[in-house]
């Protein structure tokens, strides 16, 4: 069972001092999602017993395995059901505590009732404050039964539940009709899934015979031991004031476990700690009684004395629960109550015994759960004991269960049962995850889900180049940390696998599935520098750069040009995919912007050092396009262009630019400046006869503006071929050719 205890502090004079604490003895309990298990949860469960809303309760985590609930302001806050949930996966377990008001009309004689399937359960509610009206019994909040107030027997209302079945489990309450539920007696009924002394799916297996009030779990056959007892059969008492499956926890405060209610996983339920009894667990056991709720009687023989925490303390020469066994009778010594081995191992198990006559090798035997008897292979005889060693055949899962060591001599016999847990070594269900990669290293997360049993003691990463037959390299890592595989080859695929181990011999699991992880290329090391740049328009920039000369091939796939617009906080990246390129035209830039420019060599996904940055100012955008452009042939070599000035000018035009291109021609267009911005007409001269031309124009202020519409016109026929077009502005008195 999960080692989970819910403690209720019942010193109820002041509700503000009341607290509930949930303590887990499980490895890794409560550490949350970053560890191997989910956190502990402690809460009031209002599904069945609803109380008036009050201020929210305060939850405090004390370390990784303890959580405490405080902040109760009035007694009614305490009434009801509280639950603690702990353990991971299939072991997730809920522990329930039911709190009754000490001032209620009706009080339970016993809050927790654990019964076997088919038993008759009797719930008894004692009258504390009488009302002459019906008593209503409810089950999980719904009506169950009515009793007339005359039906009280000896001041108690009894609810008999014959032939109970597991679905009958739950919270029961007895309340006077039309009285506040806070005055109810609340009970918890736990119905084991099997009849007395049985466990397992078909209830075919026999319980180990839990001692000292321990309860056999109907699913796994383990004894859930009362607080203050430990061992496979709860045969061993803890020191006073201690609890937990291994007696590892200590009751808080100077008065030990006085005033504390302990709730454990079903089917145990709740009780006082060992040595205490009463509705508030504040009364010490009466003489001759001991254990949780003082339910056990000592009945010590042969001069034994009764200790209210541990039972009979035997004088020299006697042993046994009631000091009924003479030390002459053989006795198994110091047998561990629980052993754990890994699947398919062949462990050695030792069993020591003493007695008179002295046990010999043949008088000690080991019995497996299936009834197979093993004889010892050797025995070590010492003055006070004989230790028999048994070589166990290769373990299978069916070997899990209760084993028994038995010693028989003419003086009598003794046996000791102990639990053997056969654990399955963990096997990863997934491949490790690649986090980051470089040319010579890979950073890997080894933490993966697994089948089999924890806890994980070591994680091994095995890796080697893909398609290689060389030995695997292995690194042992911490399961919760990322691992860096170093000194790898660049641009190489590696097969990487995880292997998990649990504690103990043979705890290494099979390797998990492989995954392919590829190292990056070598980092480019050369630093380019910017040779120069020039503006080719308000939104165009030509950039050139150089690289230092080094021997050997160039390590690089191309260049990355970066333009940083600090005003807008925007970066523009331009990829030049040839390592031979030393120039690039950047287009679509924002006119009038101040850019910071640099260039880097790249190889695969890796960037080399950036060049020293340059600062470039693009001219602002130009004016709108000229309007109504019109072309008119004047002769076989002249065409006149007329237009109207652009509208909404941001400033005075410095010039116009005319673009001339032969229609259908393949060559570059020719640009001609009109330096008299006030003109609205110009003549283009030196054109070829009978040739179709395309014209468009734009204005310039600080930068060139938008192009106008394109117009077409043909020169007149059959003149001589001219040397090339030139322009003359109309009304230009000088008549200079340009």
């Amino acid at each position: 069972a999960v080692d989970l205890t819910l403690l209720a502090n019942l010193r109820l004079t002041d509700p503000q001092r009341f607290f509930l604490t949930c303590v887990s003895g499980e490895a890794g309990a409560g550490r949350g999602s970053d560890a191997w298990g989910p956190p502990l949860l402690l809460e009031k469960d209002d599904r069945i017993v609803r109380t008036p809303p009050g201020p929210p309760l305060r939850l405090a985590r004390n370390g990784s395995h303890q959580v405490t609930l405080r902040g109760f302001s009035k007694p009614s806050d305490l009434v009801g059901v509280f639950s603690c949930v702990g353990g991971a996966g299939a072991r997730r377990t809920r522990v329930i505590y039911v709190h009754n008001s000490p001032g209620a009309h009706l009080l339970p004689d016993k809050v927790t009732h654990t019964v076997n399937k088919g038993d008759t359960a009797v719930l008894s509610a004692r009258v504390h404050k009488e009302k002459q009206t019906d008593v209503i019994w409810k089950s999980n909040g719904s009506y169950f039964y009515t009793l007339d107030w005359h039906e009280a027997q000896d001041g108690r209302f009894l609810l008999q539940l014959p032939n109970v079945q597991p679905p009958s489990s739950g919270i029961y309450s007895a309340t006077y009709l039309e009285a506040s539920p806070l005055g109810s007696a609340f009970f918890r009924l736990i119905v084991r899934g099997c009849g007395a002394g049985r466990w397992g799916p078909g209830c075919t297996k026999e319980c180990p015979g839990c001692l000292h009030g321990g309860v056999c779990h109907d699913h796994d056959g383990e004894c859930v031991c009362p607080p203050g007892f430990t061992g496979t059969r709860c045969e061993q008492a803890c020191r006073e004031g201690r609890f937990g499956q291994s007696c590892q926890e200590q009751c808080p405060g100077i008065s030990g476990c006085r005033g504390l209610t302990f709730c454990l996983p079903d089917p145990y339920g709740c009780s006082c700690g060992s040595g205490w009894r009463g509705s508030q667990c504040q009364e010490a056991c009466a003489p001759g009684h001991f254990g949780a709720d003082c339910r056990l009687q000592c009945q010590c023989q042969n001069g034994g004395t009764c200790d209210r925490f541990s039972g009979c303390v035997c004088p020299s020469g006697w042993h046994g629960v009631h000091c009924e066994k003479s030390d002459r009778i053989p006795q198994i010594l110091n047998m561990a109550s629980e052993l754990e081995f890994n699947l398919e191992t062949m462990p050695r198990i030792n069993c020591a015994a003493a007695g008179n006559p002295f046990p010999v090798r043949g008088s000690i035997e080991l019995r497996k759960p299936d009834g197979t008897v093993l004889l010892s292979t050797k025995a070590i005889v010492e003055p006070e004991k004989t230790t028999a060693e048994f070589e166990v055949p290769r373990l299978v899962l069916a070997d899990s269960g209760f084993w028994e060591c038995r010693v028989s001599t003419s003086g009598g016999q003794d046996s000791r049962r102990f639990k053997v847990n056969v654990k399955v070594p963990p096997v990863p269900l997934a491949a490790p995850r690649l986090l980051t990669k470089q040319s010579r290293q890979l950073v890997v997360s080894p933490l993966v889900s697994f089948s089999g049993d924890g806890p994980i003691s070591t994680v091994r990463l095995h890796y080697r180049p893909q398609d290689s037959t060389m030995d695997w390299s292995t690194i042992v890592v911490d399961p919760s940390e990322n691992v860096t595989l170093m000194n790898l080859r660049p641009k190489t695929g590696y097969s990487v696998r995880v292997q998990l181990s649990r504690p103990g011999e043979g705890g290494e699991g099979a390797w998990g599935p492989p995954t392919l992880m590829t190292t990056d290329c070598p980092e480019p090391l050369l630093q380019p520098w910017l040779e120069g740049w020039h503006v080719e328009g308000t939104d165009r920039l030509r950039v050139s750069w150089s690289l230092p000369l080094v021997p050997g091939p160039l390590v690089g796939d191309g260049f990355l040009l970066r333009l940083w617009d600090g005003t807008r906080g925007q970066e523009r990246r331009e990829n030049v995919s040839s390592p031979q390129a030393r120039t690039a035209l950047l287009t679509g830039l924002t006119p009038g912007t101040h850019y910071q420019l640099d260039v880097q060599l790249y190889h695969c996904t890796l960037l080399g050092p950036a060049s020293p940055p340059a600062h470039v100012l693009l001219p602002p955008s130009g004016p709108p396009a000229p309007r109504h452009l019109h072309a008119q042939a004047l002769s076989d070599s002249e065409i006149q262009l007329t237009w109207k000035h652009p509208e909404a000018l941001p400033g005075p035009i410095s010039k116009y630019v005319v673009e001339v291109q032969v229609a259908g021609g393949a060559g570059d267009p020719l640009w001609i400046d009109v330096d008299r911005p006030e003109e609205t007409s110009t003549i283009i001269r030196g054109l070829n006869a009978s040739t179709r031309y395309l014209f468009r124009m734009r204005a310039s202020i600080q930068g060139l503006g938008d192009w106008s519409n394109t117009v077409e016109e043909s020169t007149l026929g059959n003149g001589l071929q001219a040397e090339g077009p030139v322009q003359e502005s109309r009304a230009a008195e000088e008549g200079l050719d340009q």
């Epitope: 609803r50 009302k131 002459q132 009206t133 019906d134 209503i136 409810k138 909040g141 719904s142 009506y143 169950f144 039964y145 009515t146 009793l147 007339d148 107030w149 005359h150 039906e151 309340t175 009709l177 039309e178 009285a179 506040s180 539920p181």
Partner: antibody
Amino acid sequence: EVQLLESGGGLVQPGGSLRLSCAASGFTFSRYKMIWVRQAPGKGLEWVSSIYPSGGTTSYADSVKGRFTISRDNSKNTLYLQMNSLRAEDTAVYYCARSDLGSGWYSAEYFQHWGQGTLVTVSS
Amino acid sequence: QSALTQDPAVSVALGQTVRITCRGDRLRSYYSSWYQQKPRQAPVLVMFGRNNRPSGIPDRFSGSTSGSTASLTITATQADDEADYFCSSRDGSGNFLFGGGTKLTVL
């Protein structure tokens, strides 16, 4: 579905006897308190008798005390009303009903499930 | 003399609100319940406890208690609400009492 079915009514002479039955189905009869209520022609409802789930505790209206006996057979899911020394004023439709209790904050008793009634006529 | 007293008859205009009352000392200690009965039919529970309506009863029906008086209020009264209405309560001995009934007429 909860069902209650009364039977056993009829014509009887004053001083005579009659036994009414109420067959219950659709619920765990042995866990519920049951009652008989009657209604004389053109009159209001009158509680007659109650019996607790165990059958050990019963109560009666003053008008029928000593003459009527309520009982139950939990194994047969049946409620009974034995009526002796009948009088003309006992003429009425007799209903059996189940006592219910709200599952709210306070448990209040009420009668949500009724039979269809059986007529008892006491006349010479 | 009935220990739970009701007005014998109450009338209400269609669509209006009507209040039917029930008076008795035991209402100070115990909750009441209300039953609707139409001719030649068994009673039907319409209200119980503090102000609880069984499923199937429209929210036009509501209940309240003040001192020794319990009330059943019907808003937006419909023709189908015309019936006899009985209040009921108990005592500590488990004895039950019904009021004399109120005949509700919807005009």
